[in-house]
Amino acid sequence: SGTTNTVAAYNLTWKSTNFKTILEWEPKPVNQVYTVQISTKSGDWKSKCFYTTDTECDLTDEIVKDVKQTYLARVFSYPAGNVESTGSAGEPLYENSPEFTPYLETNLGQPTIQSFEQVGTKVNVTVEDERTLVRRNNTFLSLRDVFGKDLIYTLYYWKSSSSGKKTAKTNTNEFLIDVDKGENYCFSVQAVIPSRTVNRKSTDSPVECMGQEKGEFREI
C-alpha cells in the first residue's frame, strides 16, 4: 500500500509558555511527512502544519481563540512524495496528543521586575505585565488581563548582606514592603496561580538590587 515504512508519531507533548503553544513529537521523519490537526472537545478538526518534515507545530493561533477550552491534537503520518496513500484501514496513521487546557496548563513565563522605588522605609516594587498572544477586540491581552485575580506574584526580598528571603504577595502587579533604613535590598519575583494543580509557579525573575539603575531612592 506504500505505507510499510510509515511510522506513527509518538511522545506527543505540549510545550506552552504564556499561551505560546507548540506541539512536539517524535520521530524525526525518514521518508515521511506529518500533518497536525487540532480540535476542541466539541469542535471540528482544523489542519495545521501541512505535510511538514518538522517534529513540532505552533498551535498558538488556535488555542488563543479560547484559552479555557480543552484541546486535542493529532499527528498524521504520510509517506513522503505520496501523501494520498493511506494505512491498511484506509486511513493515514495518526496518534492523539494528551488533552490540553491552556488556562490551566500553560507554563508561567519568567517575570521581570519593571522598577522599584524607595520612599523612606517603604519600597514599591512593580512587576512588568507581560503581553500574551491572546487577543480581545484586536488587542493583545496581558497576563493579568487573562488571569485576573487568579494570578498572584510572590516577592522574595532580602538584605544584600544576608541570605534569608522574606516574602510578600500581591494580586496586582505591585508590592509595597517595609524595609530597614540604610539597608540595601535585593528582589526577585515569582508568578503563581494557586488555583492550579500543575504548573503553579514560574521560574524566578532576574534579581534586582537597590543601588542599581532600575531603582529610585527618595528620602523623606
Epitope: K149, I152, T154, Y156, S163, G164, K165, K166, T167, A168, K169, T170, N171, D178, Q190, V192, P194, T197, V198, R200, K201, T203, D204
Partner: antibody, heavy 121, light 107 residues
Amino acid sequence: EVQLVESGGGLVQPGGSLRLSCAASGFTLTGYWIHWVRQAPGKGLEWVGYIDPYNGATYYADSVKGRFTISADTSKNTAYLQMNSLRAEDTAVYYCARADYYYVDEYWDYWGQGTLVTVSS
Amino acid sequence: DIQMTQSPSSLSASVGDRVTITCRASQDVNTAVAWYQQKPGKAPKLLIYSASFLYSGVPSRFSGSRSGTDFTLTISSLQPEDFATYYCQQHYTTPPTFGQGTKVEIK
C-alpha cells in the same frame, strides 16, 4: 491522599546535631511552600522557618538563624530540617506543614504528625 | 515582627454554648489570618483561612470574622469534640506569627 510524614527526632546532647525529614506524598513539593513549626512541652506554636522547594528560598526565625538549615530534595519529594548546635530550649515537637494560597492569603492545610526532639545531657 | 495577641488564654464552657475567641494584630494584616485547632498530642488542624473562609470539611458551627486588626473565631454551639486549644496566625509578613493559644475546657 496528601500526607506529610516526619522522622528523625530523638534524644541529642547539647551542642549536638539532628536532621529531621518531612516526606511528602499525594502532591509535588515544588508547587507549594514548606514551613517548619515547633512546640515546646506545654507551650504554644513557634514558627521555625520555611522553604520554597521550587527555588530553594528560605527564611528562619531569629531564635534558630545560623544554627538550623532547611533544604529540600525534590527528587525524593522530601524537605529537611538540619539542626546544629542544639540547646535545651530547642526541645520540642517539630512539625512540617504545607502552605498554599487562597488568592494572596496563605494557609497551612496539611501538617505532619510531629517528631519529638529532646536536647538533654 | 507582627504580634498576635489572643484572648482569653483559657475558657470554660458547656456543650451548646456559643464561644468567641479574639486575636488582635499589632499592625494591619489585611485578611491574612488563619485559625487552627489542636488537640493534645496531635498536629494543628486548619479551621479558617483568609480571616473568614471555612476550610473544607470543617463544621459550619465554626466561623471567622475581621474588624480592622481584630479577628474573631466563633463556635456557635460547642460540641464535645471542640474541646481543644485554638491558635490564630498571621502570614501577612515574614515571619508568620501565632497567637498564644486559647484552651477551651469543659465547665
